[in-house]
């Protein structure tokens, strides 16, 4: 009988140890959850505040209305310029209006002076039509002033306050454009 009681007591003690372990695990898990919750809240808070403080354009880009512009500091041929813009999630500049043209030429004067800058304009080899990179036609006031005599592909560039044309394989600076981030506050 005594042996039976002692066995039951040992079993109960074993159960108690297991429960204590489970409780300890639970407490540890709860503490870990609380820590994770704190971390998540802090992370969300940081994300929200950084989103709140973030500017509509990346560093070294210029904003005008809904667009951000990047004026390159390197020369490249037209096709490589396009690639360089794509790397940044942008395309070569597409000038939609005289107001945008004025802003660009005004900004260039302040930044660098009178250099050549590739834009996203090229001339179709067959039809001779000028088209922006998305396939749209430039407005009549925004056609390159001089027709290039090049037998090769011809692309558009900005110089001073004019839109001009040149062999796409010549080296120039370039301007990229992307949409400005809309502020939600």
């Amino acid at each position: 009988k005594l042996l039976q009681v002692s066995t039951i007591a040992m079993q109960q003690q074993e159960k108690l140890i297991q429960q204590e372990r489970a409780l300890l695990n639970f407490t540890e898990w709860k503490r870990s959850c609380a820590l994770q919750m704190k971390y998540c809240q802090a992370f969300m808070q940081n994300s929200l505040s950084s989103a709140h403080n973030s500017s509509p354009c990346p560093n070294n880009w210029i904003q005008n209305r809904e667009s951000c512009y990047y004026v390159s500091e390197i020369w490249s041929i037209w096709h490589t310029s396009q690639e360089n813009c794509l790397k940044e999630g942008s395309t070569l500049l597409q000038i939609e209006s005289k107001e945008e043209m004025d802003f660009i030429t005004g900004s260039l004067r302040k930044i660098k002076g009178s250099y050549d800058y590739w834009v996203g304009l090229s001339q179709d080899g067959h039809s001779g039509r000028w088209l922006w990179q998305d396939g749209s036609s430039p407005s009549p006031g925004l056609l390159p002033a001089e027709r290039s005599q090049s037998a090769n592909q011809v692309c558009g560039y900005v110089k001073s306050n004019s839109l001009l044309s040149s062999n796409c394989s010549t080296w120039k600076y370039f301007i990229c454009e992307k949409y400005a981030l809309r502020s939600s506050v």
């Epitope: 690639e83 794509l86 790397k87 940044e88 999630g89 942008s90 395309t91 990179q133 992307k178």
Partner: nanobody, 115 residues
Framework: QVQLQESGGGLVQAGGSLRLSCAAS????????MGWYRQAPEKQRELVAA???????TYEDSVKGRFTISRDGAQNTVYLQMDSLKPEDTAVYYC?????????WGKGTQVTVSS
Amino acid sequence: QVQLQESGGGLVQAGGSLRLSCAASGSVFSINAMGWYRQAPEKQRELVAAITTQGRTTYEDSVKGRFTISRDGAQNTVYLQMDSLKPEDTAVYYCKAWTAKDDYWGKGTQVTVSS
């Protein structure tokens, strides 16, 4: 790392249409733009069309008005709808993804346009 898988190539008659797909996997959050290149035999690889994550597009002159690039952000997939195909569109079409640091290429899909 970004992995790209193209599909949709094939043989089509001149004037016909094809739709190419390129599915990206891996570090897709780092992609800034995706696009299509093509390479015909004995020719250099050329950019056909590209689209940025903002939806800005760029096309090679000879495909403007015939090809349309689009994307499905949720599926991390880019499509190239090719209409009014010409024999000179015959090439291997490669998908490319641009990140700020690196460029990634797919293995390519063959498009053949017969006259």
